[in-house]
Amino acid sequence: ITRQSLDPQRRAAPQQKRSSPTEGLCPPGHHISEDSRECISCKYGQDYSTHWNDFLFCLRCTKCDSGEVEVNSCTTTRNTVCQCEEGTFREEDSPEICRKCRTGCPRGMVKVKDCTPWSDIECVHKESGTKHTGEVPAVEKTVTTSPGTPASPCS
């Protein structure tokens, strides 16, 4: 899951690379100065921007929560990618928590798909082959999200 926020407290360090905006916008990996005259590079491993923009501050890199593993570290143009750790998964309709995968199928059913970070195990009836989805307990740790969701995916 990607989480992002603008950080008004952090200003660009003097050694950061600077260039001029194009059509009033700065390229991915940069943000714009308050006077709109310069593009200032984001700080590697600290913040990022994925699109052409006129952000006054780059977006803060996500820190993976406990219960998650970092599969891609943050760069100046891409946010951290966090994944639920083994034995847990994140559903599309409840992305804020990693849920524990079921350990087995109900009686009379057989497992056809293993647990992945994106889905629970999948069980089907032995005879009919019909899918079964069960209630899944939530892991105590929740994944916190910042206010404001990007309209477009920023991975």
């Epitope: 603008l6 194009t22 714009i32 923009n53 404001g148 309209a151």
Partner: nanobody, 126 residues
Framework: EVQLVESGGGSVQAGDSLRLSCAAS????????VGWFRQTPGKEREFVAA????????YYADSVKGRFTISRDNAKNTVYMQMASLKPEDTAVYYC???????????????????WGQGTQVTVSS
């Protein structure tokens, strides 16, 4: 933290006017440009208008050009959208957006935004 608060929505007749306001309650929009998008049920949010808060440059979707006017009051940290000659097809939830994102520098229409307001409903009946 950037927080956008819209107001001014409501129900009007075709041909009427409304003025929407977007205030940055965190004292910063976090970006130079601020825009308005709108969304109708079952459809994606579509860009309506944007303004550069530094120099006042404006950008409009073709569907609202000549009818909607976006403006800003930097002292009040507020962006407005005056909507005139409203049509039933303007009925939507209108969202204020900051941290606009573009695929290319020459693009006039943003592909998305980082920060969104909660939305304000505009209903235009014939």
């Amino acid at each position: 933290e950037v927080q956008l608060v819209e107001s001014g929505g409501g129900s009007v007749q075709a041909g009427d006017s409304l003025r929407l306001s977007c205030a940055a309650s965190g004292r910063t929009f976090g970006s130079i440009r601020v825009g308005w998008f709108r969304q109708t049920p079952g459809k994606e949010r579509e860009f309506v208008a944007a303004i550069n808060r530094n120099d006042g440059t404006t950008y409009y979707a073709d569907s609202v050009k000549g009818r909607f006017t976006i403006s800003r009051d930097n002292a009040k940290n507020t962006v407005y959208m005056q909507m005139a000659s409203l049509k039933p097809e303007d009925t939507a939830v209108y969202y204020c957006a900051a941290g606009l994102q573009y695929n290319r520098s020459a693009d006039r229409v943003p592909v998305g935004a980082v920060y969104w307001g909660q939305g304000t409903q505009v209903t235009v009946s014939s």
